[in-house]
Amino acid sequence: MSANATLKPLCPILEQMSRLQSHSNTSIRYIDHAAVLLHGLASLLGLVENGVILFVVGCRMRQTVVTTWVLHLALSDLLASASLPFFTYFLAVGHSWELGTTFCKLHSSIFFLNMFASGFLLSAISLDRCLQVVRPVWAQNHRTVAAAHKVCLVLWALAVLNTVPYFVFRDTISRLDGRIMCYYNVLLLNPGPDRDATCNSRQAALAVSKFLLAFLVPLAIIASSHAAVSLRLQHRGRRRPGRFVRLVAAVVAAFALCWGPYHVFSLLEARAHANPGLRPLVWRGLPFVTSLAFFNSVANPVLYVLTCPDMLRKLRRSLRTVLESVLVDDSELGGAGSSRRRRTSSTARSASPLALCSRPEEPRGPARLLGWLLGSCAASPQTGPLNRALSSTSS
């Protein structure tokens, strides 16, 4: 290299990461194998679970505002789960990103998109529940499935917008031991006149903004919404509905537990720019907490099922339908079985939040599956007496 050739500028913390060399330690090898196995399993589970949740909630349940929130959460988790196999491959080839810079940017962006989308959607769920209790008349008039989808669309747009810097500043960096990192390179675009200042300010801005926007603000909204609901229901002398509260509480708790450590280490990493002593702690901890954040997408579907008995019932029914469709005669399939069901109007008033965990009667058998395959998955099943009763209440 000529004396005047300026090397690719890297922030000190990133350059030091590029200098870290792999160990051939046997115990570390076992940990690597276990990590590959664990992430591989999580990839498979995440894809299957979220796929099933999307099918069950989107196709086997009556569309309500609540099912809309869950649908979008599951979609976000499915995206994250779809990126997990590539992270597993990264681990399997010895912690080296062999899939190119563009895919490095895309893969990382999915992780951050899921982070923002999850935070925003959980905030929306809490605000929605709060509005139902605090402004019941307004909620009665304005809470529609169409409105919920529009809100989700706005939230997705905001999540994409917040993900842009992570796409822009993601890069592949060659380590001195030959491995390739897929990591932040905040000097990638317009490094400015002083690299040290740019490194410190940009890394801090990224860490603090994601902590605030994707974690602290959503949790503050969730906490204040919960407090407002609890106060209002106490004044009314009513017990709050159990099931939906349990579902939201479980999902929020999982979100806080899975993403909390990630944000702590992300903030520590920003501090490590000025305090090199923190770097080893960050290097050791970040891979673990990043995986924990990924696993949130695998945990959520389990929580939906565990906190919602009806979800499990519908899940069993759906799986039986799939088996029946494999065994059924072609003649029995006849004309698409979706004719006896009507599609839910996009502006139809939604049921209470309990509708997600209610038990509407619905058509069974292969006709239902074929109807779904032919594109009428949003068709509304016949509403059972319990669901009708629940629909008339406001939680």
Epitope: N4, P193, D194, A197
Partner: antibody, heavy 118, light 107 residues
């Protein structure tokens, strides 16, 4: 060809001040971090100061902190070391050095001798 | 501050000999180590950076190795121009300290 030429050294009394300069050429000066390193006669090397490429960040070891100030003028391709409250133990050959990236001094000047004596 | 201890402080060797100089840090420096060669009356010259990487224009008979706190500079076959003083320096946490030097002399 990369060239670093130090100047400003000489004899100074204890408690006195001196300003060293390092003229850089043959490379894009504003793209590189720079440092000053000194070597007492017959002794080893000691890192004295470091400055970021834009001049916003500086670092010093405890032995010189508060007495020495590193600065740079990117328009003049020049690095400076302002030395105040000089002591006998500051007597050394002072080298300016270019950082390869964030560390590692890949090019050094020929050095300038600073003698602190009464 | 991190202390860098070089050994030996001096050694006598013949042309063609294999020479090994070690540098021990008082704490883990994560491969953030450089080796310099200095000849009398001259400025130091970078030989190895990041513990294992050979600097531009440095002959392949020089090599760096090590990890954690222990690092080594090896000259596989000593040449007449290699007789000099060698210094290690860490770049982990400031202040960036040097080893006291190892003088390689002709036997």
């Amino acid at each position: 060809e990369v060239q670093l030429v130090e100047s400003g050294g000489g004899l100074v009394q204890p408690g006195g001040s001196l300003r060293l300069s390092c003229a850089a050429s043959g490379f894009t000066f504003s793209s590189y971090l720079m440092s000053w390193v000194r070597q007492a006669p017959g002794k080893g090397l000691e890192w004295v100061a470091r400055i970021s490429n834009g001049g916003s960040t500086t670092d010093y070891p405890g032995t010189v902190e508060g007495r020495f100030t590193i600065s740079r003028d990117n328009s003049k391709n020049t690095l400076y070391l302002q030395m105040n409250s000089l002591r006998a133990e500051d007597t050394a050959v002072y080298y300016c050095a270019r950082h390869r990236t964030n560390w590692d001094f890949d090019y050094w000047g020929q050095g300038t001798l600073v003698t602190v004596s009464s | 501050d991190i202390q860098m201890t070089q050994s030996p402080s001096s050694l006598s060797a013949s042309v063609g000999d294999r020479v090994t100089i070690t540098c021990r840090a008082s704490e883990n420096i994560y491969w953030n180590l450089a080796w310099y060669q200095q000849k009398p009356g001259k400025a130091p010259k970078l030989v190895v950076y990041a513990a294992t990487q050979l600097a531009d224009g440095v002959p392949s008979r020089f090599s760096g190795s090590g990890s954690g706190t222990d690092y080594t500079l090896t000259i596989s076959s000593l040449q007449p121009e290699d007789f000099a003083t060698y210094y290690c320096q860490h770049f982990w946490i400031t202040p960036w300290t040097f080893g006291q030097g190892t003088k390689v002399e002709i036997k």
